[in-house]
């Protein structure tokens, strides 16, 4: 059987404080424990949750935790269930509330010599005791003219007189704590001889040169006095008016009339009522001069048919607040329908093309009227005037593809080539009317082109295939001057393309036929063994039926290619001595020799006194220094070819001879000594 070792018990608890209902169970097998509140399972929250088998309250709540708690233990296997004793909280709390008028029913009914009852809406458990205050001073129960009923939480004033006027508050305390009224009550019982407001002046806004009227009335017994003052404290009477208030009139009933109002009349007017007793009552009202500013400009708007759009009209700053309305074609828009005004907004629902045009927002107040136009365009989907056509464009010439469309507003046209957007550059240009110009058509421009014409309403597109009519041309053009190595095999290629595959043949420029050892094989001129006589001018001729023929002239030179007779060697020289780097080359035409030292060409005209290049090509450097060390390259070149060879130069310190060495001992490496 399931047995409760600890059962929950009823207990006192404080609102908002911690509490714990204990429950401990012993059973033969595992059980699960849950809690009921008034018979319903308790769901865990951050405020109230199971802690083991017990129920923990982080903050007791007098509303959510009132009721009967019960701990239930269940053996889910056997189905046996045991229930603890019921437990509940005696929750102690106190809650602030306002001081309210209980009698009479409204403040307006409070008259001198009537009974006034106030109630303190502080509640709590256990019932708190109450203390009343007037203007912060405690009221004791035994005082004359009032009684305090703690049970009713009431303060009764009988009869109420002017001496009871003041701010009433209450506080209450119990075992739980203390609270004071959240809102206090101001009791005002007038003395008949005190001035009381009957009619207070209101702020006025008038247009320039119009009239303004302020009303003001007080009552008292005996009747009170009334005086008007303007901002600078100058009294206004029918006998003595300030200079800037010449057109002011004070009527017998207290009203003040100002005629032909000017900017200097704007400001605060004070109406002062004084009874036989009591303080003066000062009432203020402001005279504002009406004004209206200019309206901001509208940007033109583009809308699409079928959509719903709104245009907001920001009213200009003004006093009084300007009223706003919309007009179209001189007619004020209604407040409902398809095209209507809602607040300050122009609303166009299910826009039609016919809605396009100028709409005007008007704003007006006493100071005048302002207006601002907004131009509304209803966008249409573009339509074709001329679609791009499949075209044959000539290579090297400008090519044009049309894309002529019309719409409102003017459509924007973009072009794509092979699905890639064409950005305007030196080769492509899109004209204002949408036409694409290809400045100099190339073979690879032969592909698909697509143009898209768009407005906010939508877009249309079309594509066309471009076929490039290739011009007859050499690919690549043969080099006009070429060299062949004497006594060797040589080839001179010539190829061309055109709309039709061209025929290619070689001729000697003088018209003589090619010798038998020279063959023309599909445009490649082949020399089996070059002789001196093969030098000369040759012409490559490419031709086809539709395009005729083209010619390329080539001057062939026969040359003996360069070889080095003498090459510079790796050289080591003592500092201060002279270095000689020899270089001699042969070939036909006779090669020229240049030297490169430490990665720069040595210009013979700018060598200075230490360096010299001999006619035979050798380089001499006098008075060598360590910085002359490095690689030196001999470059031999003629009109047909170029060749180079290099060697390092080392500059070393001259060793001091040791006594053991004889004067004729050889250096440890190859040297040039001078």
């Amino acid at each position: 059987a399931i047995v409760f070792i600890k059962q929950p018990s009823s207990q006192d608890a404080l609102q908002g404080r911690r509490a714990l209902l204990r429950c401990e169970v012993e059973a033969p097998g595992p059980v699960h424990v849950y809690w009921l509140l008034d018979g319903a399972p308790v769901q865990d929250t951050e405020r109230r949750f199971a802690q083991g088998s017990s129920l923990s309250f982080a903050a007791v709540d007098r509303l959510q935790d009132s009721g009967t708690f019960q701990c239930v233990a269940r053996d889910d296997v056997t189905g046996e269930e045991a229930r603890s004793a019921n437990a509940s909280f005696n929750i102690k709390w106190i809650e602030a509330g306002p001081v309210v008028l209980k009698h009479p029913a409204s403040e307006a009914e409070i008259q001198p010599q009537t009974q006034v009852t106030l109630r303190c809406h502080i509640d709590g458990h256990p019932r708190p005791t109450y203390q009343w205050f007037r203007d912060g001073t405690p009221l004791s129960d035994g005082q004359s003219n009032h009684t305090v009923s703690s049970k009713e939480r009431n303060l009764t004033l009988r009869p109420a007189g002017p001496e009871h006027s003041g701010l009433y508050s209450c506080c209450a305390h119990s075992a739980f704590g203390q609270a004071c009224s959240s809102q206090n009550f101001t009791l005002s019982i007038a003395d008949e001889s005190f001035a009381r407001v009957v009619l207070a002046p209101q702020d006025v806004v008038v247009a320039r040169y119009e009239e303004a009227m302020f009303h003001c009335q007080f009552s008292a017994q005996p009747p009170p006095s009334l005086q008007w003052l303007f901002e600078d404290e100058t009294p206004i009477t029918n006998r003595s008016r300030p200079p800037h208030l010449r057109r002011a009139t004070v009527f017998a009933n207290g009203s003040l009339l100002l005629t032909q109002v000017r900017p200097r009349n704007a400001g605060i007017y004070r109406c002062i009522g004084q009874g036989q007793r009591g303080p003066p009552i000062i009432l203020e009202a402001t005279l504002h001069l009406a004004e209206i500013e200019d309206m901001p400009l509208f940007e033109p708007r583009v809308f699409t048919a079928g959509s719903e759009e709104r245009v907001t009209c920001l009213p200009p700053k003004g006093l009084p607040e300007p009223s706003v309305w919309w007009e179209h074609a001189g007619v004020r828009l209604p407040t409902h329908g398809r095209v209507y005004q809602k607040g300050h907004e122009l609303v166009l629902a299910n826009i039609a093309e016919s809605d396009a045009g100028v709409y005007t927002c008007h704003a007006a107040n006493l100071a005048g009227q302002r207006r601002q136009d907004v131009n509304i365009t209803v966008a249409t989907v573009p339509s074709w005037l001329k679609k791009p056509q499949d075209s044959q464009l000539e290579e090297g010439k400008p090519g044009y593809l049309d894309c002529l469309t019309q719409a409102t507003p003017k459509p924007t046209v973009v072009w794509y080539r092979n699905q890639m957007l064409i950005s305007e550059d030196s080769r492509f240009e899109v004209f204002k009317n949408g036409t694409l110009r290809i400045n100099s058509v190339e073979v690879y421009d032969g592909t698909w082109y697509r143009c898209m014409s768009s407005t906010p309403a939508g877009s249309i597109e079309a594509q066309a295939r471009v076929q490039v009519l290739e011009k007859l041309k050499f690919t690549p053009p043969p080099q006009p001057q070429q060299c062949m190595e004497f006594d060797k095999e040589a080839t001179v290629p010539c190829s061309a393309t055109g709309r039709e595959k061209p025929t290619i043949k070689w001729e000697r420029a003088d018209g003589s036929s090619l010798p038998e050892w020279v063959t023309d094989n599909a445009g490649t001129l082949h020399f089996a063994r070059v002789t001196r006589d093969d030098a000369g001018n040759y012409t490559c001729i490419a031709s086809n039926g539709p395009q005729g023929q083209i010619r390329a002239h080539v001057q062939l030179t026969v040359a003996v290619f360069i070889t080095f007779k003498v090459e510079p060697e790796r050289t080591t020289v003592y500092q201060g001595h002279t270095a000689l780097l020899q270089c001699e080359a042969q070939g036909d035409p006779k090669p020229l020799i240049q030297w490169k030292g430490k990665d720069r060409i040595l210009d013979p005209t700018k060598l200075g006194p230490r360096m010299h290049i001999f006619q035979n090509g050798s380089l001499v450097i006098h008075d060598v220094a360590p910085e002359d060390s490095g690689r030196y390259t001999c470059i031999a070149g003629n009109s047909c070819n170029i060749k180079h060879t290099e060697a390092p130069l080392y500059v070393v310190d001259k060793p001091v001879p040791e006594e053991s060495e004889g004067p004729g001992s050889p250096p440890p490496y190859k040297m040039i000594q001078t």
């Epitope: 699960h32 018979g39 056997t78 046996e80 045991a82």
Partner: antibody, heavy 112, light 110 residues
């Protein structure tokens, strides 16, 4: 001997009502929770509801409103009242005490 | 509405195999452990195997074991025996005295 016996099953027309009984022997219902579980032909087990030791009842969301569990402790019997029956209510209905002790089940067929 | 999902729905295995069935709940079970496993054979009432996630019911062989917490649980049969071919159900208890079954896992001979 502790055992549960269901009864009251049978053929009923769509829209009709039926009351199943589960008679317990060998223990007192007032100390135990009793479950009703059903199983449609060829389908899985489906929990219907529970009545706890105090007589409070709790139901699967689909059973609320149409099905009612009650008990008579003097007869040591638990009941399942089924109203507005539909063809999809056709199943073997089991009563069970806790997880361990199950009845043999009773077949309810809803068909016109 | 609480949903308990078993996987796989069907499982073919051989005698001696290790078999794992998982059960996932759409919300945590009460106390994170109020979960049971049943075995059912055709025409019979379900038989309790495991209760409170991992406790073996009386008379159930030790090759059956359960584990998990919160909303994810597993039933393991360490070495399948001929008598173990049946349908298995998980069964969860939730706050508010609400219970639910998984849709079942049918274990068949490979």
């Amino acid at each position: 001997e502790v055992q549960l016996v269901e009864s009251g099953g049978g053929l009923v027309q769509p829209g009709g009502s039926l009351r199943l009984s589960c008679t317990a022997s060998g223990f007192s219902l007032s100390n135990y929770v009793m479950n009703w579980v059903r199983q449609a032909p060829g389908k899985g087990l489906e929990w219907v509801g529970i009545i706890d030791s105090s007589g409070s009842t709790y139901y699967a969301s689909w059973a609320k409103g149409r099905f009612t569990i009650s008990r008579d402790t003097s007869k040591n019997t638990v009941y399942l009242q089924m109203n507005s029956l539909r063809a999809e209510d056709t199943a073997v209905y089991f009563c069970a005490r806790g997880l361990y002790l199950w009845g043999q089940g009773t077949l309810v067929t809803v068909s016109s | 509405e609480i949903v308990m999902t078993q996987s796989p729905s069907t499982l073919s295995a051989s005698v001696g195999d290790r078999v794992i069935i998982t059960c996932q709940s759409s919300q945590s079970v009460y106390n994170n452990n109020l979960l049971a496993w049943y075995q059912q054979k055709p025409g019979k009432a379900p038989k309790l195997l495991i209760y409170y996630t991992s406790n073996l019911a009386s008379g159930v062989p030790s090759r059956f074991s359960g584990s998990g917490s919160g909303a994810e649980f597993t039933l393991t049969i360490s070495s399948l025996q001929p008598d173990d071919f049946a349908t298995y159900y998980c069964h969860g208890g939730y706050n508010g005295n609400i219970y639910a079954f998984g849709q079942g896992t049918k274990l068949t001979v490979l």
